[in-house]
Amino acid sequence: HNFNITIKEIIKMLNILTARNDSCMELTVKDVFTAPKNTSDKEIFCRAATVLRQIYTHNCSNRYLRGLYRNLSSMANKTCSMNEIKKSTLKDFLERLKVIMQKKYYRH
């Protein structure tokens, strides 16, 4: 039940973040969603949270990005590998995270 509430809250944050296209959305971040198919949810959440934590250093930390980081961290492994070479914009990262979260919400 708590898992579903957290996912729902994450989706709301992603909905409002992806509606906008401010300067921060152009930030380059690691494309952490190119992981193998068998990667666990907790590993994916950890990777996504790590990307969000790195955004803090760019003066792009609004309340929704902070909330996303908090919520993802609460469901994630404490550590994870971050050896991706590929990059994406923050906007694309958030759009892809939204698709992943919607799939998880409707599956539960």
Partner: antibody, heavy 116, light 109 residues
């Protein structure tokens, strides 16, 4: 202290043009989306347009798209609304507002009256 | 584009609790915002992200949002709460800010 001051409201004939300005102070203007919202006499709030922090990216309500243009000059901490082909139904108080994911600061508004 | 429906008017007795609703398809999937507007004044943000209050807004004002209805609750109503109240959401598909039609709250007594 955050302040937004709108100017430029006037009486104008249908088909005429007007440019509204909104001067911002008390915050880093270039770091925020800004919006224009209007309110016809005795009516509710209607969002008009918004512009991203660095300019360029704009959105408009269907009722004004193609007639109104929102812009900003971050060096002057000023937001603009160019209003062309004005109609009687554009008569309203026009507010500018800071948009920090929620319209958290508003100006006092400027009255635009479109009438012959 | 999203459509948000509010009752045009709501009355409450002094000291009692008033609820103002804002109905919209799947509004619970979006964040709801609420504004208070007194005559001759600009609107003021009183609730953001469904239920959070900006600093300076009294605890008597609270918000909730579920499925198709967002609700603003004013407990222990005071004379100064008499005003117009507007809900607002972000419409993702239209990339637009959408307001409800507004509700006039009358405080009786």
């Amino acid at each position: 202290e955050v302040q937004l001051v709108e100017t430029g409201g006037d009486l104008v004939e249908p088909g005429g043009s007007l440019r509204l300005s909104c001067v911002a102070s008390g915050f880093t203007f270039s770091g925020y989306y800004m919006s224009w919202i209007r309110q016809a006499p005795g009516k509710g709030l209607q969002w008009v347009a918004d512009i991203r922090d660095s300019g360029g990216n704009t959105h408009y309500a269907d009722a004004v798209r193609g007639r109104f243009t929102i812009s900003r000059d971050n060096a002057k901490n000023t937001l603009y609304l160019q209003m062309d082909s004005l109609r009687a139904e554009d008569t309203a108080v026009y507010y500018c507002a800071r948009d920090d994911w929620g319209l958290d600061y508003w100006g006092q508004g400027t009255l635009v009256t479109v009438s012959s | 584009q999203s459509v948000l429906n509010q009752p045009p008017s709501v009355s409450v007795n002094l000291g009692k609790t008033a609820s103002i609703t804002c109905e919209g398809d799947n509004i619970g999937d979006k964040y709801a915002f609420w504004y208070q507007q007194k005559p001759g004044q600009a609107p003021v943000l009183i609730i953001y992200d469904d239920s959070k209050r900006p600093s300076g807004i009294p605890e008597r004002l609270s918000g909730s949002n579920s499925v198709n209805t967002a609700t603003l609750t004013i407990s222990g109503a005071r004379a100064e709460d008499e005003a117009d109240y507007y809900c607002q959401v972000w419409d993702n598909s239209a990339k637009a800010i959408v307001f409800g039609g507004g509700t006039h709250l009358t405080v009786l007594g």
